[in-house]
């Protein structure tokens, strides 16, 4: 559940090679201010980030737990064919599992959150073979495709 040292891979980045003393950001700041990059805009930015970040956190939780599991007894569990069920066990009781269970039980669906819509749309498109580039782009922007694929591939989506 740690947030430490987690890379925000949902965001593109490019390292600046500019000397900070001649930073073009400084020169463009009047323009930025006139366009209004203050608290109201930041609030909107945070709104857009909230759903993305939650999915990213879920994926990170899954990655961390997979890594812990692998380090702990990877050989034995692969030999026994219990890797998938063990990962589910690690997720049990944790926030990722809680949210997935919350979606599955329909509580989220009643509130029509974007997460449910994305999961269900992806499921439909996989089913009818129309998983489009457009959907790929949307999911990339949400940093959610890996998580959703993982959802589809696990028993959690059996909705038992």
């Amino acid at each position: 559940r740690s947030l430490q040292d987690t890379e925000e891979k949902s965001r593109s980045f490019s390292a600046s090679q500019a000397d900070p003393l001649s930073d073009p950001d400084q020169m463009n700041e009047d323009k930025r201010h006139s366009q209004g990059t203050f608290t109201s805009d930041y609030s909107k930015y945070l709104d857009s980030r909230r759903a993305q970040d939650f999915v990213q956190w879920l994926m990170n939780t899954k990655r961390n737990r997979n890594n812990i599991a692998k380090r702990h007894d990877e050989f034995e569990r692969h030999a026994e064919g219990t890797f998938t069920s063990d990962v589910s066990s690690y997720l049990e009781g944790q926030a990722a599992k809680e949210f997935i269970a919350w979606l599955v039980k329909g509580r989220g669906r009643r509130d029509f959150p974007e997460e449910v819509a994305i999961v269900e749309e992806l499921g439909r498109r996989h089913a009818d073979g129309s998983f489009s580039d457009e959907m790929n782009t949307i999911l990339d922007n949400l940093a959610a495709r890996d998580f959703i694929n993982w959802l589809i591939q696990t028993k959690i989506t059996d909705r038992k």
């Epitope: 890379e7 759903a51 959150p113």
Partner: antibody, heavy 119, light 112 residues
Framework: QVQLVESGGGVVQPGRSLRLSCAAS????????MHWVRQAPVKGLEWVAF????????FYADSVKGRFTISRDNSRDTLYLQMNSLTPEDTAVYYC????????????WGQGTLVTVSS | DIVMTQSPDSLAVSLGERATINCKSS????????????LAWYQQKPGQPLKLLIY???IRESGVPDRFSGSGSGTDFTLTISSLQAEDVAVYYC????????FGLGTKLEIK
């Protein structure tokens, strides 16, 4: 381990400028948003500015708008805060803070650098 | 902006006893789409950087002792230290990160 070290603080007269720096280490600087937060004795902790990892998004508190500029150099793992037209109300300890995977949540802070605006 | 109100301003508790700090937000910080409260707790010791203790109201950050716990939902939140240790003497701040971040004014925790 993650370390954030601020520098550039000092005593400055009203109306003058100051540039703060924050040297980051122990994490992949170019993949995280960064913030400046200040702490004044009376006002407490106050968020000042944010810059996204790719520099495409910058936001400022209304109290510093038009006067402060946040920037970063990902090749140098350094965050900056250019402060112009300083007033006594800007007197505070200024902290740089690393954003966690969750927006506007700060998982690491620097020790802070004191800025005193006084005539 | 969301206003964060902490109480009490200061608190003196005996070693080994329970310490409780309250935080109230001027509007809900619950995000209905994931049922998470966007509320964090930080610890500030003299001469040290602030330290993240709790986020999403109740999730302990890695490395934080389990005597620290967070609870609450909507607008009312609590940080509890189940058995106060000498090293817990500090100022504690709540922060909402639902929207433009704002902080409480802090609660100074001392040993009685």
């Amino acid at each position: 381990q993650v370390q954030l070290v601020e520098s550039g603080g000092g005593v400055v007269q009203p109306g003058r400028s100051l540039r703060l720096s924050c040297a980051a280490s122990g994490f992949t600087f170019s993949t995280f948003g960064m913030h400046w937060v200040r702490q004044a004795p009376v006002k407490g902790l106050e968020w000042v500015a944010f810059i996204s990892n790719d520099k495409n998004n910058k936001f400022y508190a209304d109290s510093v708008k038009g006067r402060f500029t946040i920037s970063r150099d990902n090749s140098r793992d350094t965050l900056y805060l250019q402060m112009n037209s300083l007033t006594p109300e800007d007197t505070a300890v200024y902290y740089c803070a690393k954003e966690s995977i969750l927006a506007a949540l700060f998982d690491y802070w620097g020790q802070g650098t004191l800025v005193t605006v006084s005539s | 902006d969301i206003v964060m109100t902490q109480s009490p301003d200061s608190l003196a508790v005996s070693l080994g006893e329970r310490a409780t700090i309250n935080c109230k937000s001027s509007q809900s910080v619950l995000y209905s789409s994931n049922n998470k409260n966007y509320l964090a707790w930080y610890q500030q010791k003299p001469g040290q950087p602030l330290k993240l203790l709790i986020y999403w109201a109740s999730i302990r950050e890695s490395g934080v002792p389990d005597r620290f716990s967070g609870s609450g939902s909507g607008t009312d939140f609590t940080l509890t230290i189940s058995s106060l240790q000498a090293e817990d003497v500090a100022v504690y701040y709540c922060q909402q990160f639902y929207t433009v971040p704002t902080f409480g004014l802090g609660t100074k925790l001392e040993i009685k």
